[in-house]
Interface confidence: low
């Protein structure tokens, strides 16, 4: 293949690859602990955003869907699934009221919603 | 790797791939032939809408691009640029005024446009 | 067509309450989020809060919260915004507006993309 | 929240000519600012947003350019109806705000 072309991944079977990330949209409505464990039982987790560069793809994307941020009370940050802070500049945070979940909305906005309101969601892995 | 996961490729550096297709989109603003030059240039082609089932991930797109599809004024038909004829029912084709190409926009929806008018464009390489 | 029908005028007396009603049609009502935006006379647009008409969730600006409440009723498919202890300088013609989510041409998320035809509210003595 | 101020205020102009509108954004907005035009007695229209996309049915004599906190809304020769006030908005810090306002009038 040519230098300047390359195989991206792995990923699941049909999911979309980009930089090295899998990703892939579902469009059944979940609740976002369902969201998350449907992303879990397939390896995957919640949509985790990490670079406006890296996953600039996510600009494109229309509607609302879940990802893996929520609100820590305790100390009122807001962390992903992983237990990683979410960096400054990265999301725009709309805080919808009495909400400790975010649903990723196009052009890295983050909508704080109620965890029990059914949503579609994004999944994502990322490869070694 | 485990069975359910694989490769997707080989595409240009940083392009999307999804179902071994190449995806990529371009978001300064040209018309309708620099943004067939700008993919050929490339070894893509303008977007080209051939299947709702392996280009599902075409439905989550916000906004709206130059794809591939151009009127035939002599005989009435739309045509892709390898030549081919659209498929029936791909694509609800939508005339916003008098055009000869075809704006891709979300949700299988293909908008008639003057060529001359500048839009951003999805440029696309199938993977053999 | 996509349509806000906003309910008619109306004249408070300072200190009461009004209920603007906005009721939607053309779409999937509870696949938009609403804004209200308010325009005193002869000033420009303020931005007054959002609701998500799925969940009922809401944001206020900072200026109205605590006397603003937007609520929604998903059977009629109708946003409502209720302001209380009005006072002269609320007098203004109050819009819907949906914010448009990607799935019209041209259109792109936050920006309002239907507009009601606004509802005056006069408070006056 | 992001302050957006407009000039000039008011700007007066006969059919034909060519109209610069400029938004200002207290900090930066990358390029998430649409423009509005509002009629006399009518709700706002959107006309531009992402900074330089036309939305739905709006005339090509409309176009936005602009990014970061700089932004300019041209119309490249004014026909009768385009006599109105043009509002700008920025949607990439909560909460959106609106501009003051610019005023075209028929000179």
């Known amino acids: 293949i040519p230098l300047t072309e390359s195989y991206c991944g792995p990923c699941p079977k049909n999911w979309i690859c980009y930089k090295n990330n899998c990703y892939q949209f579902f469009n059944e409505s979940k609740n976002w602990y369902e969201s998350q464990a449907s992303c879990m039982s397939q390896n995957a987790s919640l949509l985790k955003v990490y670079s406006k560069e890296d996953q600039d793809l996510l600009k494109l994307v229309k509607s609302y869907h879940w990802m893996g941020l929520v609100h820590i009370p305790t100390n009122g940050s807001w962390q992903w699934e992983d237990g990683s802070i979410l960096s400054p500049n990265l999301l725009t945070i709309i805080e919808m009221q009495k909400g400790d979940c975010a649903l990723y909305a196009s052009s890295f906005k983050g909508y704080i919603e109620n965890c029990s309101i059914p949503n579609t969601y994004i999944c994502m892995q990322r490869t070694v | 790797i485990p069975l359910t996961e694989s490769y997707c490729g080989p595409c240009p550096k940083n392009w999307i791939c999804y179902k071994n297709n190449c995806y990529q989109f371009f978001n300064e603003s040209k018309n309708w032939y620099e943004s067939q030059a700008s993919c050929m240039s490339q070894n893509a082609s303008l977007l080209k809408v051939y299947s709702k089932e392996d280009q599902d991930l075409l439905k989550l797109v916000k906004s709206y691009h130059w794809m591939g599809l151009v009127h035939i004024p002599t005989n009435g038909s739309w045509q892709w640029e390898d030549g081919s004829i659209l498929s029936p029912n791909l694509l609800t084709i939508i005339e916003m005024q008098k055009g000869d190409c075809a704006l891709y926009a979300s949700s299988f929806k293909g908008y008639i446009e003057n060529c001359s008018i500048p839009n951003t464009y999805i440029c696309m390489q199938r993977t053999v | 067509q996509v349509q806000l029908v906003q309910s008619g005028a109306e004249v408070k007396k300072p200190g009461a309450s009004v209920k603007v009603s906005c009721k939607a049609s053309?779409?999937?009502?509870?696949?938009?989020?609403m804004h209200w935006v308010r325009q005193a006379p002869g000033q420009g647009l303020e931005w007054m809060g959002i609701?998500?008409?799925?969940?009922?969730?809401?944001s206020y600006a900072q200026k109205f919260q605590g006397r603003v409440t937007m609520t929604r009723d998903t059977s009629t498919s109708t946003v409502y915004m209720e302001l209380s202890s009005l006072r002269s300088e609320d007098t203004a013609v109050y819009y819907c507006?949906?914010?448009?989510?990607?799935?019209?041409?041209?259109?792109?998320?936050?920006?309002?993309?239907?507009w009601g035809k606004g509802t005056t509210v006069t408070v006056s003595s | 929240e992001i302050v957006l101020t407009q000039s000039p205020a008011t700007l007066s102009l006969s059919p034909g000519e060519r109209a610069t509108l400029s938004c200002r954004a207290s900090?930066?907005?990358?390029?998430?600012l649409a423009w509005y035009q509002q009629k006399p007695g009518q709700a706002p229209r959107l006309l531009i947003y992402?900074?330089?996309n036309r939305a739905t049915g709006i005339p090509a004599r409309f176009s936005g350019s602009g990014s970061g906190t700089d932004f300019t809304l041209t119309i490249s020769s004014l026909e009768p109806e385009d006599f109105a006030v043009y509002y700008c908005?920025?949607?990439?810090?909560?909460?959106?705000?609106f501009g003051g306002g610019t005023k075209v009038e028929i000179k």
């Open positions: 507006a949906r914010e448009g989510a990607g799935f019209a041409y041209g259109m792109d998320y936050y920006y309002m993309d239907v």
């Open positions: 053309g779409y999937t009502f509870t696949s938009y989020y």
């Open positions: 609701i998500n008409p799925s969940g009922g969730s809401t």
């Open positions: 900090q930066s907005v990358s390029s998430y």
């Open positions: 992402d900074a330089s």
């Open positions: 908005q920025q949607s990439d810090n909560w909460p959106f705000t």
